[in-house]
Interface confidence: low
Amino acid sequence: QRKRRNTIHEFKKSAKTTLIKIDPALKIKTKKVNTADQCANRCTRNKGLPFTCKAFVFDKARKQCLWFPFNSMSSGVKKEFGHEFDLYENKDYIRNCIIGKGRSYKGTVSITKSGIKCQPWSSMIPHEHSFLPSSYRGKDLQENYCRNPRGEEGGPWCFTSNPEVRYEVCDIPQCSEVECMTCNGESYRGLMDHTESGKICQRWDHQTPHRHKFLPERYPDKGFDDNYCRNPDGQPRPWCYTLDPHTRWEYCAIKTCADNTMNDTDVPLETTECIQGQGEGYRGTVNTIWNGIPCQRWDSQYPHEHDMTPENFKCKDLRENYCRNPDGSESPWCFTTDPNIRVGYCSQIPNCDMSHGQDCYRGNGKNYMGNLSQTRSGLTCSMWDKNMEDLHRHIFWEPDASKLNENYCRNPDDDAHGPWCYTGNPLIPWDYCPISRCEGDTTPTIVNLDHPVISCAKTKQLRVVNGIPTRTNIGWMVSLRYRNKHICGGSLIKESWVLTARQCFPSRDLKDYEAWLGIHDVHGRGDEKCKQVLNVSQLVYGPEGSDLVLMKLARPAVLDDFVSTIDLPNYGCTIPEKTSCSVYGWGYTGLINYDGLLRVAHLYIMGNEKCSQHHRGKVTLNESEICAGAEKIGSGPCEGDYGGPLVCEQHKMRMVLGVIVPGRGCAIPNRPGIFVRVAYYAKWIHKIILTYKVPQS
């Protein structure tokens, strides 16, 4: 299989991306070709290249290869967006684990198992040897990096800088040890690219040697990146098509994570008495189908043989013979004990939406004493007594311990958005519980707002139309990029946190996103000196119905002349009518020859009552919304500016008072814009910043 391999499978692809060398001493080689596959083959074989090829870019417009002796992790190089470019990086140079004996390992570990620094391969001090880079071409005996040029048993090794120890193996883990998955790996997005028998996986975007239906563009949320193992179809574990023409597909050897913490976006809400959605989270004990026929045990193969076993579907709670929905069917079901009826739906289980006497809370739920003990994302609450230290850290009074029993959802800190609990998951320290306010409860959670309550309507996308190009200090303005393209705005409210809108995240895969800071041009042209590009490490969704997201950056932004934070308003504050404010965005501007520059549109605050009248009484605003009208006809937010801020100034302080979300019209004369009122959610924002761990700079 190695002999006739199509080498493009050995590369990690970053679409619409190229590498720009800042260091002019770095060499590159180019040539006209027809396909990226041709570039890959030449890069892998280093054929006719005056350097070791670590990456290449395929220029689709010019049908040209650019081969590089560096990759995106090298110094003197930066990534840049470009529609016509696709960047391919040799996985061997960016992998930090080994496959098999590690013969292909080309990473940068340079310390042995016992912690001794490696001797450079080109040096004979302190140990003389015959492993010269010139004698082992293609084995990448660079610097003093651990290598296994002969494919020996112990894995990558090196001569050591200690005269007493000639050589020693390096402690580089097997990729199969590093990679782990939860449940059956449906949410696995790791980098395993070979099967359990060692066959290399076929790229998902290729149809050779095996034609298939799982096209990445057709299933954008399945994580079909490069040729990594995935589980898009509810199999017992991740798998891939292989490069072996005789083996269509095979499972991959990915172990189950030790703590088995599920990604919160993938966990269905667990219920025991009723069905939420399709009932994937149903964990009750109903064990007959709709007509009373008893269910067959999941761990039994009689009377019906099947592969829906507890071993194959680890997190689906296939206990006893209870109705479950492990495979995304329309509702919970089971195999039946009647040999003539293989499966049946348990449609007698009521729908949660219809069940009466459901849990609810009044006001902000500070007196809620129900016994729900699960967050909205399905995580089990952890005991209050284990979390008192954390609780004391963000409230300035002694909580009522008599209310904080067991792990029930509570509201000890007077949170405006209802009961919550700690989770025990370090990534999601706490979250709200799926309890609604009681029907007919109109107790305001904050006072002084002129409004009845109604949910927000969602219509068109928003972009700043007919705005004026801005060059003032707007260092807090963030361009959120999705697959290398601007998709939304955002506001940097803390070095590691960006406030934006829920609608900005079409995919669950955080690798799809980047935050660009310090730019004025949407493509970053002319902003090279000031631009910061940061990855996204977590999304924290706002309280139910808020449309807000706090986006955590993988590392803190560096505050300088071009990047700054913007202040938040005080919780529950109101700003006087006619206060002058501005909205910012890079969205479509109504101009034919759009220059891609950040625009600003000036608006003024309007009371909720008056705002409702301007919308011909078709909308009523609630305490979580704020309204601002344009000074200029047809000027205001429009498509593509979601997540961006409504910025107002009061007492010489600029702050983000609103967030642009899909609103009620796009730059329509006499139609003011309706924004999420940040003041209503300020406590939530502060609480997240205080309680969620962020990386240190």
């Epitope: 034609r211 597909w249 069917s329 329309e330 739906y345």
Partner: antibody, heavy 117, light 112 residues
Framework: VEESGGRLVTPGTPLTLTCTVS????????MGWVRQAPGKGLEYIGM?????RAWYATWAKGRFTISKTSPTVDLKITSPTTEDTATYFC????????????????WGQGTLVTVSS | QVLTQTPSPVSAAVGGTVTINCQGS????????FSWYQQKPGQPPKLLIY???TLASGVPSRFKGSGSGTQFTLTISGVQCADAATYYC?????????????FGGGTEVVVK
């Protein structure tokens, strides 16, 4: 794959056709229904996936209901009209992993439905 | 989405070649999501070709499929008496949140 239940019905009288499979695990294969009016071409009605979810051709939505309880797949014609007179075929779709297309690789002989007053 | 088959009917002598075209009103969701079926009187259709050019199991190699996008062709070379039948093309189109399947109107092949 064997269809049954075809008969003469009056307009508006609901009719359920049954497709019985043997040697096919319905938890691994999707099944589809296709019809053919006398002397006319094939017309796709809909299919039921391995997880029990049904999809329909745009024109067939509301007029037909597909369901399954292994080893049978049912097609219910909710309110037949004379235009529904046809031979109804039940067919297996090739396994998802063999091709990316919806392809009917195994067909029953069909069952004739006549709608007439 | 409409699939138009031409010509119909088509006749060929034993040993000759028959070409049937199928034109789509819009592109398929994937260039190759296309199949050909053979149906003889009183029988159900039989799969000949899928993915535009892949021969189904047990189908003689004289049947050949080609084309992509909106234009597809079935060629029968070295026609035999047993090939007298009606041939249907079938394409899969993107249609809202599901895939729509459509059949062509059929082409009758008469063997002389």
């Amino acid at each position: 794959v064997e269809e049954s239940g075809g008969r003469l019905v009056t307009p508006g009288t609901p009719l359920t056709l049954t497709c019985t499979v043997s040697g096919i695990d319905l938890s691994n294969y999707a099944m589809g229904w296709v019809r053919q009016a006398p002397g006319k071409g094939l017309e796709y009605i809909g299919m039921i996936g391995v997880n029990g979810r049904a999809w329909y051709a745009t024109w067939a939505k509301g007029r037909f209901t597909i369901s399954k309880t292994s080893p049978t797949v049912d097609l219910k014609i909710t309110s037949p009209t004379t235009e529904d007179t046809a031979t109804y075929f039940c067919a297996r779709l090739i396994d998802e992993r063999s091709t990316y297309s919806y392809v009917f690789d195994l067909w029953g002989q069909g069952t004739l439905v006549t709608v007439s007053s | 989405q409409v699939l138009t088959q031409t010509p119909s009917p088509v006749s060929a002598a034993v040993g000759g070649t028959v070409t049937i075209n199928c034109q789509g009103s819009q592109s398929l969701y994937n260039n190759n999501a296309f199949s050909w079926y053979q149906q003889k009187p009183g029988q159900p259709p039989k799969l000949l070709i899928y993915d535009a050019s892949t021969l189904a199991s047990g189908v003689p190699s004289r049947f050949k499929g080609s084309g992509s996008g909106t234009q597809f062709t079935l060629t029968i070379s070295g026609v035999q008496c047993a090939d007298a039948a009606t041939y249907y093309c079938q394409g899969e189109f993107s249609c809202g949140d599901v895939d729509c399947i459509a059949f062509g109107g059929g082409t009758e092949v008469v063997v002389k």
